[in-house]
């Protein structure tokens, strides 16, 4: 078996009720600290 550490890319979520968006947008502001 092979363990993968993956890549960084856009992706799609296959489970509709995970509570997470298919490809979350980057937040436009940073919290202080």
């Amino acid at each position: 078996s092979e363990t993968t550490t993956g890549t960084s890319s856009n992706s799609s979520q296959s489970t509709s009720n995970s509570g997470l968006a298919p490809n979350p947008t980057n937040a436009t502001t940073k919290a202080a600290g």
Epitope: T4, S9, S18, G19, L20, A21, P24, N26
Partner: antibody, heavy 115, light 112 residues
Framework: EVNLEESGGGLVQPGGSMEFSCVAS????????MNWVRQSPEKGLEWVAQ??????????RYVESVKGRFSISRDDSKSSVYLQMNNLRAEDSGIYYC??????WGQGTTLTVSS | DVVMTQTPLTLSVTIGQPASISCKSS???????????LNWLLQRPGQSPKRLIY???KLDSGVPDRFTGSGSGTDFTLKISRVEAEDLGVYYC?????????FGGGTKLEIK
């Protein structure tokens, strides 16, 4: 019934390393994004890392504070996800949960970073 | 990062009475597909978090219908119509629209 079981917690000195494992049962593991979330009295609940599906080229995301130090991986044949943590800091201490998203959570495993 | 602000910090409620928790986000949680990825979790003492509600108002399997989620944009509410003893614990909101995913600070529900 879905079950996520973490292992690998313990005490480590600052600058040290630790690896967590999480094995899933009761679900089609390869169909689920997998995440690590941590909880501490100081920071509350904090999402740490995510690895997506083979069909997503196993895309990975990290919270900024762990980039370059933590590495998430998965082995679909073993229904397992891993979190390798290096150069640990005191602020990394807490309970680490394996989660599928927001829906299923493991029981948590505790990391203490202290000299 | 998207800041999730929960109020109140602590809620002391008599069994059988209603309870309401507010969660406000620093940015809209409406995603481009028209869905809003706002979830509510309950962490009972000594346990891991358990999800109650996803997509603002959808109840997870086995969650009693005395729980109701509502809201849109940046303003969300979790209501319990009649609090029961098993409802005690800490309630968290978490947004899954923006990266990184962020949690509210929690609201501790105590039974009077």
């Amino acid at each position: 019934e879905v079950n996520l079981e973490e292992s690998g917690g313990g005490l480590v000195q600052p600058g040290g390393s630790m690896e967590f494992s999480c094995v899933a049962s009761g679900l089609t593991f390869s169909d689920h994004w997998m995440n690590w979330v941590r909880q501490s009295p100081e920071k509350g609940l904090e999402w740490v890392a995510q690895i997506q599906l083979k069909s997503d080229n196993y895309a990975i995301r990290y919270v900024e504070s762990v980039k370059g130090r933590f590495s998430i991986s998965r082995d679909d044949s073993k229904s397992s996800v891993y979190l390798q943590m290096n150069n640990l800091r005191a602020e990394d201490s807490g309970i680490y949960y394996c989660t599928t998203g927001t829906d299923y959570w493991g029981q948590g495993t505790t990391l203490t970073v202290s000299s | 990062d998207v800041v999730m602000t929960q109020t109140p910090l602590t809620l002391s409620v008599t069994i059988g009475q209603p309870a309401s928790i507010s969660c406000k986000s620093s940015q809209s949680l409406l995603y481009s597909n028209g869905k809003t990825y706002l979830n509510w979790l309950l962490q009972r003492p000594g346990q891991s978090p358990k999800r109650l509600i996803y997509l603002v108002s959808k109840l997870d399997s086995g969650v009693p219908d005395r729980f109701t989620g509502s809201g849109s944009g940046t303003d969300f509410t979790l209501k319990i119509s009649r609090v029961e003893a098993e409802d005690l614990g800490v309630y968290y909101c978490i947004q899954g629209t923006h990266f990184p995913y962020t949690f509210g600070g929690g609201t501790k529900l105590e039974i009077k």
